[in-house]
Each structure stands twice: as structure tokens, then as C-alpha cells.
Interface confidence: low
Amino acid sequence: FKNDATEILYSHVVKPVPAHPSSNSTLNQARNGGRHFSNTGLDRNTRVQVGCRELRSTKYISDGQCTSISPLKELVCAGECLPLPVLPNWIGGGYGTKYWSRRSSQEWRCVNDKTRTQRIQLQCQDGSTRTYKITVVTACKCKRYTRQHNESSHNFESMSPAKPVQHHRERKRASKSSKHSMS
């Protein structure tokens, strides 16, 4: 019984994790250790986003009763899409010399770009196991949003009557999380 105890572990982040995501969703802080962004020179508690970042996340998945046997690794997209000149490692360089002012950058969000599906096994306290099919993020991008777009932090597609699977990301505050569905 590998996981003696669990609900959900949080996920880690890379260096200073932004204090608030660019979308209006608020995520649990990431988890188990949490990494920070590399060399941004920003304090982890800074209120300033440093751009659309791919944060490596490591977390356990739980549906309330059962927990994944080992941590799940994925990317979490976080940050604002700020003007090119202030983003040394900006994701979305394909936009070339396109320059967004700070004002218009508020219409752009750092969101999931590429994903992949994988199965994970959850171990339950009674010794049984459950299998979930989840979608994990593998790349992020800046995307233009109109006002009516208001995505929630977590999109769960749990087919079971149990509580929705929860991510615990304690490593960072990021936006958009994996989708989970019972398989």
C-alpha cells in the first residue's frame, strides 16, 4: 500500500511563482516542494507576472477516497502575456515583432496549448485501485480572450459519482489544470 495517506499533494512550481494567475481563477498554491522560475530576479511573492510561463508541476491526484500511487508530472501555464521587450523567455515568439501594450495584454492569457492523455492508477485506503484517464498539459501559449471567456481553474470530467478529482498544486498558483475522467 504505497500511499499510506493522501488526499492530494500539491504541485511544484518553478522559481518565483506569481502570486496570482492572469486569469481570474485562483489556484491552490502548488505542492510538494514547489520550484520557482529560473533567474527572473523576482521574489516568489512578487505581485508582478513575468510572462506566459510553463511551470513544471508534480502532484498527486485524488478523488477524495483514493490517491495516485506516484506523482503526476505536467506543465502548468501561468502568467500574463506581456510586451515582448520585457520577456526574455517569452513563449509565443512565432508572433515575431508583434508588440502588445500593457493595456491590450490584459486581453491575452497564458493558456494550455498542447495536451496528452494518459492513464493513472489511484490506490484506495481499502487496498483497491481505480484507473482514471487524464489529460495533462505539455505546452502553453498566449491566447486572446474576449470578455465572455471566463475559464475556471480546474476542468474535471469525472464520470464517477465521487467528488471530482482534485489537483493539489502547492507549488505555484497557476491557471488551468488537467482534465480528469474516470475510465
Epitope: 488526499e7 500539491y10 502548488a30 520557482h36
Partner: antibody, heavy 118, light 107 residues
Framework: QVQLVQSGAEVKKPGSSVKVSCKAS????????ISWVRQAPGQGLEWMGW????????RYNRKFTGRVTITADESTSTAYMELSSLRSEDTAVYYC???????????WGQGTLVTVSS | DIQMTQSPSSLSASIGDRVTITCQAS??????LNWYQQKQGKAPKVLIF???NLAAGVPSRFSGSGSGTDFTLTISSLQPEDIATYYC?????????FGQGTKVDNK
Amino acid sequence: QVQLVQSGAEVKKPGSSVKVSCKASGGTFSSTYISWVRQAPGQGLEWMGWIYAGTGGTRYNRKFTGRVTITADESTSTAYMELSSLRSEDTAVYYCAREGVDGWFTYWGQGTLVTVSS
Amino acid sequence: DIQMTQSPSSLSASIGDRVTITCQASQDINNYLNWYQQKQGKAPKVLIFDASNLAAGVPSRFSGSGSGTDFTLTISSLQPEDIATYYCQQYDNLPLTFGQGTKVDNK
């Protein structure tokens, strides 16, 4: 600024129960994990279990299963840890700890000393 | 349960010394390891997360390294305020477990 404030010291008799509280301020209580960690005098740290405040979901260290109950009251942003069938070896400082960017135990309460003595 | 073994259990060092504490896990825990500092009568404080990342507000003289089963906490130049007990903690699997601690005092 996240802060965890615990209830005061307790002296208990063997076989009785103790319930320690941990009031959280700052941050979002409902979307966080609160763990309980204990430390016997002169000893190391021992994780007892946690609660995810938003759902009330708990997980316990097998060592304490059946004796420990962790609960949370969202309306007061308070987590509780109740330990039953107390014995002298349960004499320890009990800490609540909240997850944060740096791990499961980023923010700590000040600790509550529970003394079990006849 | 994953056992975490720290060594040494205690050490004496002079101010300015380089101090190294090791932590060994009973099985591979990737880099799912944190280091904490605990001063007498106080709650622990996180120093390093994910084995090698410095927590907010922690002086740069502290560093962590390692992956798998063997990990190290290094204090490059011991300061008077570093006199404390240090714990490693794994979160690769539940239950979350700590090392037994390494007490660092002044020579």
C-alpha cells in the same frame, strides 16, 4: 500574510481525548491542505495527517488511524485535530501546517503542547 | 513507509565553516524532498524545496542538492543564527516522513 494560530496547552489523563484547534487567516482556507505534525520532547517531526478544507477530505498516517480525526470548519477557517485513547507517549507539541509554494509545510502554527500524565 | 536517514545526528562547527548534512531515503524519491530548519522552541521553517530550490527569504548560503536517494544540505558559511536542528522530509509517497534531524551547534 498567512497565519495559523493554535489553541493553548492541554494536560490530559491517559485514555482521554484532546482536541486542538488551528485558526487560519490570510489566503483561501477552502482551497488548501492543513496538516498536523507532532514532535515529542527532544524528538523529530511526525506527520499525522491532513485535511483538504474545501471538501473535508482527509488522509491519515497509518500509525494514527483510528485514533486521530482531523476536521475543518470553513465558516471560521479553523482546522481541528482530535487524538483519542491518549497515552504518555502522545506527550508532544502538536503543530498545524499549511501548504504553500514551498511545500506541504510552508506555514506553521505556533504549536500546542499536550501533556498526557496520570 | 519511506525511511529518511540523516547524518550526522549532530555536529559542532565554527562560525564561517562550511557545513554539510546528508539525508538518505530508503527508496528513490526523485527530487521530492524539502529541508527545514527548527530553532529551539519554535516551529520549523522551510529552507529548500524540491531538493535544490531556495525558499523565499532564505539566505543564499543555504543550498540543497541530490536526487533519487541521496541528498545534501550545505551551509556555505555558518552564521550564529544558523544554530538549529535541520530536518529533511520526503513527499514522494504518503505518509510524508521526516529524517530524525541533525543538530548543529557552535564549536
